[in-house]
Amino acid sequence: APVRSLNCTLRDSQQKSLVMSGPYELKALHLQGQDMEQQVVFSMSFVQGEESNDKIPVALGLKEKNLYLSCVLKDDKPTLQLESVDPKNYPKKKMEKRFVFNKIEINNKLEFESAQFPNWYISTSQAENMPVFLGGTKGGQDITDFTMQFVSS
């Protein structure tokens, strides 16, 4: 079945942008001016997931790349990664659970909770130029709040 998708960028609540850091990693850093063109454009898709009042299941792909953010166990720890997929088959309504994030939207702030690992969130560090990761704490040092910006084509 077809899915609703949109193109967007994400910035954390400290206004750090997300950029590629090598082929399979994202990092967060402050960008200005023309450097803003480096930020990753996501294709966010509305997918099937478990129901909850204010959680909306989405998948986060990299626009025009066959890469999706996914959550897997590595060394017994929930870990965020960029995973290659067959572009002929993605996005799809029934995404595998590792690709699904529960988008929580409150006052124009977004959180992305892993569907595979409840209470683990896409996170950035306070420090500059550090990897985007899956964090198991909210409201601590690490940042779990993001804003979304539609991308004009």
């Epitope: 899915v3 609703r4 509305f46 129901e51 988008k103 804003t147 910006q149 991308v151």
Partner: antibody, heavy 119, light 108 residues
Framework: EVQLVESGGGNVQPGGSLRLSCTAS????????MAWVRQAPGKGLEWVGI???????YYASWAKGRFTISRDNSKNTVYLQMNSLRAEDTATYYC?????????????WGQGTLVTVSS | DIVMTQSPSTLSASVGDRVTITCQAS??????LSWYQQKPGKAPKLLIY???TLASGVPSRFSGSGSGAEFTLTISSLQPDDFATYYC??????????FGQGTKLEIK
């Protein structure tokens, strides 16, 4: 005050075109998903389509090809371009903001603008 | 496309009554269902989303239930302000968003 105001409605002949506008005040439309919903006189609500970013628009099957939704973030306005209009397109057209991205429901509505297609 | 069917089309009731409106989807839509209230000449107002969550500012006499393909909107004790037309809406059906045909709640 947060509100949406539609404009551009009126009388048009069958086969004609019309462009409706929906302007937001009290908030920025730039990162809001905006839909159009219509209601024929004395009838129920009918979803027309929705726009996310300017490249991501979705339409009811009956609206594809004749109706186009676009946005101008600098004017805080969303548009509905309607072509090849028919008598059955006579309706009040509402714009509405999606409550949350992909929620599919609409918590903020405009007052509507009436389109009459008649010769 | 998913079709939403409401029943009854018209419902006559009195102030203080408990009333229930039903919405059926042509296939399972999980809990992706919203309810709206509309008064003549006015825009619709969101009452309930995700089948059972009350929208901001909506009185607690309104409640929603159901999942899959069968849903209900209940008003526990009708107030004069509640006489209006009510619509259900499928909010999660792929790229299409469909409304029911409406239920007119009128004074008996």
């Amino acid at each position: 005050e947060v509100q949406l105001v539609e404009s551009g409605g009126g009388n048009v002949q069958p086969g004609g075109s019309l462009r409706l506008s929906c302007t937001a005040s009290g908030f920025s439309l730039s990162n809001s998903a905006m839909a159009w919903v219509r209601q024929a006189p004395g009838k129920g609500l009918e979803w027309v389509g929705i726009i996310y970013d300017s490249a991501s628009t979705y339409y009811a099957s009956w609206a594809k090809g004749r109706f186009t939704i676009s946005r101008d973030n600098s004017k805080n306005t969303v548009y509905l371009q309607m072509n090849s209009l028919r008598a059955e397109d006579t309706a009040t057209y509402y714009c509405a903001r999606e409550r949350a991205i992909f929620s599919g429901d609409f918590a903020l509505w405009g007052q509507g603008t009436l389109v009459t297609v008649s010769s | 496309d998913i079709v939403m069917t409401q029943s009854p089309s018209t419902l006559s009731a009195s102030v203080g009554d408990r009333v229930t409106i039903t919405c059926q989807a042509s296939q399972s839509i999980s809990s992706y269902l919203s309810w709206y209230q509309q008064k003549p000449g006015k825009a619709p107002k969101l009452l309930i989303y995700r089948a059972s969550t009350l929208a901001s500012g909506v009185p607690s006499r309104f409640s929603g239930s159901g999942s899959g393909a069968e849903f209900t909107l209940t008003i526990s004790s009708l107030q004069p302000d509640d006489f209006a037309t009510y619509y259900c809406q499928n909010t999660g059906g792929g790229i299409n968003i469909a409304f029911g045909q409406g239920t007119k709640l009128e004074i008996k």
